[in-house]
């Protein structure tokens, strides 16, 4: 009976997500059969988040809207380990919007989810950011420095990275 009610709860939770994610890939967390964590297929997972590389080229605003339609945001990078995971799925000849912008052109960078911007946990390429007109951040590859961030014009279309919390059922 307990197992039955747990299954019903899971099914109703899955239905919630079905509108934007018809298919989920779930893994059992730990040893307890009760705890499953899921990411939409074909998103990738790292720690408690799911990631999606959007290869459509759009402005920063449209990219963020595209992520939010899927229940996500443009990616907020909190650690070096997280960035190292993300770059495994990126193409070196492409640039990808991050969820980081400077809306007023005052060098007051902010993350889309209101995570405080911490200068000590940023991965700007050397000499970046460097332009008051470039109010949005991308991650790209430079042969001299590998992967890092750069500020660019927000209206210039780029690929993007979406991030959402794992779905626990």
């Amino acid at each position: 009976n307990f197992m039955y009610s747990k299954t019903v709860k899971r099914l109703s939770k899955l239905r919630e997500y079905q509108q934007y994610h018809p298919s989920l890939t779930c893994v059992m967390e730990g040893k307890d059969i009760e705890d499953w964590s899921c990411c939409p297929t074909p998103w990738t997972s790292f720690q408690s988040s799911c990631y999606f590389i959007s290869t459509g080229m759009q402005s920063w605003t449209k990219s963020q809207k595209n992520c939010s339609v899927m229940g996500a945001d443009l990616v907020v990078i909190n650690t070096r380990e997280e960035q190292d995971f993300i770059i495994q799925n990126l193409k070196r000849n492409s640039s990808y919007f991050l969820g980081l912008s400077d809306p007023g052109g005052r060098r007051h960078w902010q993350w889309v989810d209101q995570t405080p911007y911490n200068e000590n946990v940023t991965f700007w390429h050397s000499g970046e950011p460097n332009n008051l007109d470039e109010r949005c951040a991308i991650i790209n590859f430079r042969s001299s420095e590998e992967w890092g961030w750069n500020d660019i014009h927000c209206h210039v279309p780029q690929k993007s990275i979406c991030k959402m919390k794992k779905i626990y059922i």
Epitope: G104, G105, R106, R107, G127, N130, N131, L132, D133, H153, H155
Partner: antibody, heavy 118, light 107 residues
């Protein structure tokens, strides 16, 4: 080539306002913000503020807030700066300058002399 | 606001000389230091940006160096057309600020 052409010299009375212009050519106007800088006679340069030619928003030096209003007309690739409540110590040459990479002003107008005198 | 100090307000040198103009910031400006030349007719031109990068069309006799709070502009082999006032400017923090200028004259 990049050119910034400023309007001519102005003589205005104390308390009055003046609007000076800066027309950009030789580049995509909306890709580069426009800075304004002033220089009183025999003095150094002073940054007044910057206006985004794309978004239309401005960042002013606190010292000039309430004194200055910056605007742009993208259809004519022209930036404007209006100075209000003019006093004799506002007499100066006013420059427009294009925003560039590495927090720099890469091309400058020829300057507009504004003389405030009764 | 960040204060920019050019301790030498005027400098006299001979043609062909090597001249160095210095600029000090009141705090670390992370190499966002630019140099401008203002001719006697009021024309202003960018010479050096980001401490040491030469702007398009600027002769290679101009060079810049420095880090942290201390920066310098060097003109090797001084030319008659270099007679001007030179200003440093920091772009690290708004409001952007300029040094007081160094007027270069020929002996």
């Amino acid at each position: 080539q990049v050119q910034l052409q400023q309007s001519g010299a102005e003589v205005v009375k104390p308390g009055a306002s003046v609007k000076i212009s800066c027309k950009g050519s030789g580049y995509t106007f909306t890709d580069y913000s426009m800075h304004w800088v002033r220089q009183a006679h025999a003095k150094s340069l002073e940054w007044i503020g910057v206006i985004s030619t794309y978004y239309g928003d401005s960042n002013y030096n606190q010292k000039f807030k309430g004194k200055v209003t910056m605007t742009v007309d993208t259809s004519s690739s022209t930036a404007y700066m209006e100075l209000s409540r003019l006093r004799s110590d506002d007499t100066a040459v006013y420059y427009c300058a294009r925003n560039g990479n590495f927090y720099v002003m890469d091309y400058w107008g020829q300057g507009t002399l504004v003389t405030v005198s009764s | 606001d960040i204060q920019m100090t050019q301790s030498t307000s005027s400098l006299s040198a001979s043609l062909g000389d090597r001249v160095t103009i210095t600029c000090q910031a009141s705090q670390d400006i992370s190499n966002y230091l630019n140099w401008y030349q203002q001719k006697p007719d009021g024309t202003v031109k960018l010479l050096i940006y980001y401490t040491s990068r030469l702007h398009t069309g600027v002769p290679s006799r101009f060079s810049g160096s420095g880090s942290g709070t201390d920066y310098s502009l060097t003109i090797s082999n001084l030319d008659q057309e270099d007679i001007a006032t030179y200003y440093c400017q920091q772009g690290n923090t708004l409001p952007w600020t300029f040094g007081g200028g160094t007027k270069l004259e020929i002996k």
